[in-house]
């Protein structure tokens, strides 16, 4: 997260750290007791590694009573996700067991109504992704409030040049932005999960390259079918 600040500890109980061989890889969001939603690209290079999900965390390194690391029983990338595109960049991770719920671990309601979030709406994005251009890794969860950007502006030739389909949304990125390591994390508007950070370009904090988020409402049928 660029230009953000440390989040209030455990105030986002849905927040997950998807880890590869014990290191934070991507964000994720608890959407059901045994399921975490993240980004498909996160597992592209994880073939030989051990993927786990950390729940109930604020600090990645410090002991916290609510923290627990779960093994992954099953990883389900969206069937249409591909390495070279940002489309359909969703992944569902089934935990080895149901998460122990409590004040610091709680699923987040996700948007099912397939309607665009109004441009200008302030949405919260959180993660343990890098916070500067030298790869500074935060130990504690960071967050930032970002205004939703209309699709027409986001699709300008100077911006994302038509790449933003109806199944994607954008948020402003002028010095405040999601960044590498935040992929898979939640974009929350009005207390509801609206988007998932895509594993796209490494350009962060550049106003001409708005952050791209996968609209979960557009994938409601797929999410429901996997969770069923």
């Amino acid at each position: 997260i660029l230009g953000g600040r440390e989040a209030e500890a455990h105030a986002r109980p849905y927040m997950a750290s998807v880890q590869l061989n014990g290191a934070h890889l991507c964000g994720g969001v608890l959407v059901a007791e045994q399921w975490v939603l993240s980004a498909a690209h996160c597992l592209e290079d994880a073939a030989d590694g051990k993927v786990q999900v950390l729940l109930g965390a604020h600090s990645l390194s410090q002991p916290e009573p609510s923290k627990r690391l779960y093994d992954v029983l099953r990883a389900v990338p969206h069937p249409d996700s591909q390495p070279d595109t940002i489309d359909h960049d969703l992944l569902l991770l089934q935990l080895s067991e149901k998460a122990t719920l409590g004040p610091a671990v709680r699923p987040l309601p996700w948007q099912r109504v397939d309607r665009d979030v109004a441009p200008g709406t302030l949405c919260d994005v959180a993660g343990w992704g890098i916070v500067n251009h030298a790869g500074r890794r935060p130990d504690s969860l960071q967050h930032v409030l970002l205004p939703v950007l209309d699709r027409a502006t986001c699709n300008r030739a100077t911006h994302h040049d038509g790449a933003i389909t109806e199944r994607l949304m954008c948020a402003e990125s002028n010095r405040r932005d999601s960044c590498k390591g935040d992929s898979g994390g939640p974009l929350v508007c009005g207390g509801v999960l609206e988007g998932v950070v895509t594993s796209g370009s490494r350009v962060c904090g550049n106003a001409k390259k708005p952050g791209i988020y996968t609209r979960v409402a557009s994938y409601a049928a797929w999410i429901d079918s996997v969770l069923a």
């Epitope: 590869l20 061989n21 290191a23 890889l25 290079d45 590694g49 990645l60 390194s61 500067n132 251009h133 030298a134 790869g135 500074r136 890794r137 935060p138 130990d139 590498k180 490494r202």
Partner: antibody, heavy 118, light 107 residues
Framework: QVQLQQPGAELVRPGTSVKLSCKAS????????MHWVKQRPGQGLEWIGV????????NYNQKFKGKATLTVDTSSSTAYMQLSSLTSEDSAVYYC???????????WGQGTSVTVSS | DIQMTQTTSSLSASLGDRVTISCRAS??????LNWYQQKPDGTVKLLIY???RLHSGVPSRFSGSGSGTDYSLTISNLEQEDFATYFC?????????FGGGTKLEIK
């Protein structure tokens, strides 16, 4: 356990180049950026720059742009720093350090001592 | 660039003592302050980051504190292996910069 292995010493001629290596083990190489730091005899430490092994993105201290070039070989989990147009000012110990939390370097190599002499 | 100043370049102490090493930044570094130990053979280890979190494997006799521009490292109950040089480093603003070091010597 995390280990960063660096050769002990390099003796090089003025005006030439040298490529220093830092072989990582005990962790997933592409998951952590790698820093390089310079220490002149009896002096403090200077940050040279950092590289992300997952895509070779680099960020340099302005002072070392044109002097240092950072690269990686992910197949051997090795980070490299090439120093060019060497002068006596480049005689120093050079460390690699794994990117830790909050701008720290959590594991360091033993350092390579570079002596520039004719 | 942010200047990091360790006013005490050397410090003498005895086994079992408690010592405090200070570090001042030329501007607010928002707690992005780290401490390292360098042994005479050149070996460097991270002790503390941000600015009071103990790196894994570091004994609890080491502690850090501070905010804004002023930070300190405290070593309680000094042991033989603690006699070394200690550097502070700011990780707030590029380029990252280090203090000049404080050499802790045996009295």
């Amino acid at each position: 356990q995390v280990q960063l292995q660096q050769p002990g010493a390099e003796l090089v001629r003025p005006g030439t180049s040298v490529k220093l290596s830092c072989k990582a083990s005990g962790y997933t190489f592409t998951s952590y950026w790698m820093h390089w730091v310079k220490q002149r005899p009896g002096q403090g430490l200077e940050w040279i720059g950092v590289i992300d092994p997952s895509d070779s993105y680099t960020n340099y201290n302005q002072k070392f742009k044109g002097k240092a070039t950072l690269t990686v070989d992910t197949s051997s989990s090795t980070a490299y720093m090439q120093l060019s147009s060497l002068t006596s000012e480049d005689s120093a110990v050079y460390y690699c350090g794994r990117n830790g939390y909050d701008g720290s370097m959590d594991y360091w190599g033993q350092g390579t001592s570079v002596t520039v002499s004719s | 660039d942010i200047q990091m100043t360790q006013t005490t370049s050397s410090l003498s102490a005895s086994l079992g003592d408690r010592v405090t090493i200070s570090c001042r930044a030329s501007q607010d570094i928002s707690n992005y302050l780290n401490w390292y130990q360098q042994k005479p053979d050149g070996t460097v280890k991270l002790l503390i980051y941000y600015p009071s979190r103990l790196h894994s494997g570091v004994p609890s006799r080491f502690s850090g504190s501070g905010s804004g521009t002023d930070y300190s490292l405290t070593i309680s109950n000094l042991e033989q292996e603690d006699f070394a040089t200690y550097f502070c480093q700011q990780g707030n603003t590029l380029p990252y910069t280090f203090g000049g070091g404080t050499k802790l010597e045996i009295k």
